[in-house]
């Protein structure tokens, strides 16, 4: 799998989409996991509803939400109030039994807020009670890593 880069602005919401073949993955729940190192496991962050017929219902874990259009074949993950520590490598997965197929490998990059030099009084800061439904979603900038680019930079 190539790795697709999604860029979002710190403090805003980032939407990651993972298209898939709806027939091939029919009846399968999906998950979003965070890659722990190049060879490490992918740690589950959030998964779709435990009844596949209700996969379109938004499920969330902390600031991350997931919803699945099983007929259209698009898994959507929303990272709300994006923070620098959210940057990293992730996977969209299709689950079957104890196995998981990778739908897409994702690199999330967090950009500095271009407004952060302004006086805090000029900034609108979303409240803790803001729901995912109300969250403003920045159109994410995405691209695939170029051939030769290293997904995991070598550690010194």
């Amino acid at each position: 799998h190539n790795t697709t880069v999604f860029q979002g602005v710190e403090g805003q919401s980032l939407q990651v989409s993972c298209p898939y073949d709806s027939m091939k993955h029919w009846g399968r729940r999906k998950a979003w996991c965070r890659q722990l190192g190049e060879k490490g496991p992918c740690q589950r962050v959030v998964s779709t509803h435990n009844l596949w017929l209700l996969s379109f219902l938004r499920r969330r874990n902390g600031s991350t939400a997931i919803t699945d259009d099983t007929l259209g074949g698009t898994l959507t993950i929303t990272l709300r109030n994006l923070q620098p520590h959210d940057a990293g490598f992730y996977q969209c997965q299709s689950l079957h039994g104890s196995e998981a197929d990778t739908l897409r490998k994702v690199l999330v990059e967090v950009l500095a807020d271009p407004l952060d030099h302004r006086d805090a009084g000029d900034l609108w800061v979303p409240g803790e009670s803001e729901s995912f439904e109300d969250a403003h979603v920045e159109h994410s900038i995405s691209r695939s890593l170029l051939e030769g680019e290293i997904p995991f930079p070598p550690t010194s």
């Epitope: 009844l51 017929l53 007929l71 259209g72």
Partner: antibody, heavy 126, light 106 residues
Framework: EVQLVESGGGLVQPGRSLRLSCTAS????????MSWFRQAPGKGLEWVGF??????????EYTASVKGRFTISRDGSKSIAYLQMNSLKTEDTAVYYC?????????????????WGQGTMVTVSS | DIQMTQSPSSLSASVGDRVTITCQAS??????LNWYQQKPGKAPKLLIY???NLETGVPSRFSGSGSGTDFTFTISSLQPEDIATYYC????????FGGGTKVEIK
């Protein structure tokens, strides 16, 4: 008039099978998920399982206690949903209801059930 | 599985009284909750869906509120025809019902 009518209930011995039917009228049957519920005498409501609308190709989901024993199916040409119950146990004794899932759009529905049948009694006893 | 704790299990109130029933989920269920009314010998009837939306044709004296783990169902002015058992139902994880609240007239 939108309505659901269940049939097929009765007295059956443990280990035997029974098939319940739910006949729909007054609405486009293929557009809705259909669910089965049950209520043991003097007890609360329990979800048994449901089947997706035609768009979902007859995909089914079940509660753990009936998985592998009960099968839900649907016949769009007759507007009937079925509950095939095999290997029945005494604890399956209940009034069985079929119900229609509330529809938002082609893709989306909510498991709020806005039309219910009158129920049919199933007694499992030797 | 998510447990739904409904309280009280029964209550007696006078016609015109405000009646409140609560439902508590064992974990956060967002707003994935419905309320039903069941009269003796009859099938359940959907009153409220998605925690706070009034089903078409249901009198406005019925209302629902809440999100997360705590939900409330209210009858603003109890009527004789409201004698029934009321159930909450969650669908955040599988589908489960509360134990029911039997409402009687004093």
């Amino acid at each position: 008039e939108v309505q659901l009518v269940e049939s097929g209930g009765g007295l059956v011995q443990p280990g035997r099978s029974l098939r319940l039917s739910c006949t729909a009228s007054g609405f486009t049957f293929d557009d809705h998920a259909m669910s089965w519920f049950r209520q043991a005498p003097g007890k609360g409501l329990e979800w048994v399982g449901f089947i997706g609308s035609k768009a979902y190709g007859g995909t089914t989901e079940y509660t753990a206690s009936v998985k592998g024993r009960f099968t839900i199916s649907r016949d769009g040409s007759k507007s009937i949903a079925y509950l095939q119950m095999n290997s029945l146990k005494t604890e399956d004794t209940a009034v069985y209801y079929c119900a229609r899932g509330k529809r938002y759009s082609y893709t989306y529905w909510t498991p709020a059930f806005d039309v219910w049948g009158q129920g049919t009694m199933v007694t499992v006893s030797s | 599985d998510i447990q739904m704790t409904q309280s009280p299990s029964s209550l007696s109130a006078s016609v015109g009284d405000r009646v409140t029933i609560t439902c508590q989920a064992s974990q956060d269920i967002t707003n994935y909750l419905n309320w039903y009314q069941q009269k003796p010998g009859k099938a359940p009837k959907l009153l409220i869906y998605d925690a706070s939306n009034l089903e078409t044709g249901v009198p406005s004296r019925f209302s629902g509120s809440g999100s997360g783990t705590d939900f409330t169902f209210t009858i603003s002015s109890l009527q004789p025809e409201d004698i029934a058992t009321y159930y909450c139902q969650q669908y955040d994880s599988y589908l489960t019902f509360g134990g029911g609240t039997k409402v009687e007239i004093k």
